[in-house]
């Protein structure tokens, strides 16, 4: 489909280019030219050039608000790497690094656990998990990881959860949860993942991050 | 249509207790945050507090636990309790419906006046 | 507590004036503040939110501006019914606090 998009894309900018260099020869008075495409050439671009300086006003108006609305609505995005910790927490760490992204000041990553947001909206947050495990040297328990949230002056709690059973592979099986959903956050909110076990979690290149994106 | 009707004000002792009522119509408590806000006479707005969705409530600190929110999800009606009045809680009560994604207040009650004198 | 000061306290305007009202906060609020207009006897009518959005079923004469500590009501041209009390409200930190508000009268 990309490919497509941009055949079609290069195919309008030919066009474009194109009739640019027909009104310049029309202009410069080229034989090969006959009088009536040029008149109807010129006619069409006459005709652009008159919206465009009709439209040049009403945009002149709107422009400061544009820039102020572009301002104030600003795109609101982080993917963060997962990092090994030392700590016994059960909750994931993070950094910014590798082909990590923190759009800007609106959201931030706090104590490398959280992601904290500034502007209360619909945001989409979801994260993956990757863990090696092995069913005789893990308990019973399924392997288990939890997206939660703590918003200012409220409790803590769990927005998505999700359940697998350990590998019989040996010595662990790799397997990947992801988790993603959309909430409302309010301003100061942070988001966060737990998992029943850290020890387990894959921090190769690509297999576990987190992120959010305000819609 | 979206209505929150307040009731239940009206002049109290200092040191007496009264209990606000904020009848809403046109949605339910629990699909959305009702907060109550007041306005003693030639003052600001002040906020109060919120009754979330879920249950959960959430109080301005400087209120000193004098203030309780809950609510009767049958009778889709959000209370606010005070005790220990004070002359300075004479004010316009008003209850008012948050916007959904946003902590602004998009609804709001006529307010009940509650008088706090001896 | 963010402390919010909004002025002017009360001004004086006339039908088709252009009339700008501002509120300073006390810490930057990352855009998270409304607006609400208040007529006597009657409840606040929120006006605009998140700065600059315009709540449903309010005129366009009415648009919000700012960022960091301080923000602006513009009413592009006065009409008869917008002679009323304004407030700005942040609610960027609990507990959330309003401006002590601005009275537009007749001039």
């Known amino acids: 489909h990309r490919r497509l998009d941009k055949i079609e894309d290069e195919r309008n900018l030919h066009e474009d280019f194109v009739f640019m260099k027909t009104i310049q020869r029309c202009n410069t008075g080229e034989r090969s030219l006959s009088l009536l495409n040029c008149e109807e050439i010129k006619s069409q671009f006459e005709g652009f050039v008159k919206d465009i300086m009709l439209n040049k006003e009403e945009t002149k108006k709107e422009n400061s608000f544009e820039m102020q609305k572009g301002d104030q609505n600003p795109q609101i995005a982080a993917h963060v790497i997962s990092e090994a910790s030392s700590k016994t927490t059960s909750v994931l760490q993070w950094a910014e690094k590798g082909y990590y992204t923190m759009s800007n000041n609106l959201v931030t990553l706090e104590n490398g656990k959280q992601l904290t947001v500034k502007r209360q909206g619909l945001y989409y947050i979801y994260a993956q998990v990757t863990f090696c495990s092995n069913r005789e040297a893990s308990s019973q328990a399924p392997f288990i990881a939890s997206l939660c949230l703590k918003s200012p002056g409220r409790f803590e709690r769990i927005l998505l959860r999700a359940a697998n059973t350990h590998s019989s592979a040996k010595p662990c099986g790799q397997q990947s949860i992801h988790l993603g959903g959309v909430f409302e956050l309010q301003p100061g909110a942070s988001v966060f993942v737990n998992v029943t076990d850290p020890s387990q979690v894959s921090h190769g290149t690509g297999f576990t991050s987190f992120g959010l994106l305000k819609l | 249509e979206v209505q929150l009707v307040e009731s239940g004000g009206g002049l109290v002792q200092p040191g007496g207790s009264l209990r606000l009522s904020c009848a809403v119509s046109?949605?339910?408590?629990?699909?959305?945050?009702v907060h109550w806000v007041r306005q003693a006479p030639g003052k600001g707005l002040e906020w109060m507090g919120v009754?979330?969705?879920?249950?959960?409530?959430s109080y301005n600190s400087v209120l000193k636990s004098r203030f309780t929110i809950s609510r009767d999800t049958s009778k889709n009606t959000v209370y606010l309790q005070m005790n220990s009045l004070r002359a300075e809680d004479t004010a316009v009560y008003y209850c008012?419906?948050?916007?959904?994604?946003?902590?602004?207040?998009?609804?709001w009650g006529q307010g009940t006046l509650v008088t706090v004198s001896s | 507590d963010i402390q919010m000061t909004q002025s002017p306290s009360s001004l004086s305007a006339s039908v088709g004036d252009r009339v700008t009202i501002t509120c300073r906060a006390s810490e930057d609020l990352y855009y998270n503040l409304a607006w609400y207009q208040r007529k006597p006897g009657k409840a606040p009518k929120l006006l605009i939110y998140?700065?600059?959005r315009l709540a449903d079923g309010v005129p366009s004469r009415f648009s919000g501006s700012g960022s960091g500590t301080d923000y602006t009501l513009t009413i592009s041209s006065l009409q008869p019914e917008d002679f009323a009390s304004y407030y700005c409200?942040?609610?960027?930190?609990?507990?959330?606090?309003f401006g002590q508000g601005t009275k537009v009268e007749i001039k």
């Open positions: 008012a419906r948050q916007l959904t994604h946003y902590y602004v207040l998009a609804a």
């Open positions: 409200q942040q609610y960027y930190k609990f507990p959330f606090t």
């Open positions: 009754i979330w969705g879920d249950g959960d409530t």
């Open positions: 998140d700065t600059y």
């Open positions: 046109g949605f339910s408590s629990t699909n959305y945050h």
